[in-house]
Interface confidence: medium
């Protein structure tokens, strides 16, 4: 896991409450799990289904909880060190540059393709020429083209948060 | 389209240092997250450290805690990663890489949108 960080991740800073657990920054830092006072004498923990920290980090707040959105399924939970995982319904896909949403997977192949590759969440099926072997990313075909499939079973996660 | 140069990199003695820097253009860095990743031969792509635009704090790996630091100059639209007590596991292409809006959150080398052609440190 990696942490790249935007404006929407950033939970609005909190004074610590009494129950939050204090440590000290390792050479500045705090540890996976809290965020650093804004004094720089103290290790704040992240609050648990709320915000998290992934890495050695000095940030003044935790990153706040992703909630998966609608055509997602939750495959993990938020906990103080890791994001919550979404993964799109089965029979949707997300593709690294469409990112924002899930797309209805294709159902089948256009006539002269055949499918070598199943509906995932993070792919749509992959369909190749008979003869040439050649793929096929072109736009979803008409129905009387198709030869119908039904999606591939979820294999593992496809988390763009973390 | 934003484009990213990273330079800075060379062959550098254990417990040497470097700096590298990346420098943007095609728009202000200031709203972005930016972030360096590295790339070792035959190894997957790994987080190295991320800023947060706002001097809300930063993020490193474990592998560089206390040894890397990472800041930016939103003025010069420049990010830098200075990089002391370097090691031989150290050795790798670094990337500089830039969320592509302020809403998105990436949080995997997968997810991160611009990326720059890196930059080969030699620890050796």
């Known amino acids: 896991e990696s942490a790249l960080i935007t404006q929407q991740d950033l939970a609005p800073q909190q004074r610590a409450a009494p129950q939050q657990k204090r440590s000290s920054p390792s050479e500045g830092l705090c540890p996976p799990g809290h965020h650093i006072s804004e004094d720089g004498r103290d290790c704040i923990s992240c609050k648990y289904g709320q915000d998290y920290s992934t890495h050695w980090n000095d940030l003044l707040f935790c990153l706040r909880c992703t909630r998966c959105d609608s055509g997602e399924v939750e495959l993990s939970p938020c906990t103080t060190t890791r994001n919550t995982v979404c993964q799109c319904e089965e029979g949707t896909f997300r593709e690294e540059d469409s990112p924002e949403m899930c797309r209805k997977c294709r159902t089948g192949c256009p006539r002269g393709m055949v499918k070598v590759g199943d509906c995932t969440p993070w792919s749509d099926i992959e369909c190749v020429h008979k003869e040439s072997g050649t793929k096929h990313s072109g736009e979803v075909p008409a129905v009387e083209e198709t030869v119908t499939s039904s999606p591939g079973t979820p294999a593992s996660p496809c988390s763009l948060s973390g | 389209e934003v484009q990213l140069l990273e330079s800075g990199g060379g062959l550098v003695q254990p417990g040497g240092s470097l700096r590298l820097s990346c420098a943007a253009s095609g728009r202000s860095i200031s709203n972005y997250a930016m972030g360096w990743f590295r790339q070792a031969p035959g190894k997957e792509r790994e987080f190295v450290s991320a800023?947060?635009?706002?001097?809300?704090?930063?993020y490193y790996a474990d592998s560089v805690k206390g040894r890397f630091t990472i800041s930016r100059d939103n003025s010069k639209n420049t990010l830098y990663l200075q990089m002391n007590s370097l090691r031989a596991e150290d050795t790798a292409v670094y990337y500089c890489?830039?969320?592509?809006?302020?809403?998105?959150?990436?949080?995997?080398?997968?997810?991160?949108?611009?990326w720059g052609q890196g930059t080969l440190v030699t620890v050796s």
């Open positions: 890489v830039v969320a592509r809006t302020p809403e998105t959150p990436i949080t995997s080398a997968r997810g991160a949108n611009y």
């Open positions: 800023s947060v635009w706002n001097n809300g704090g930063n």
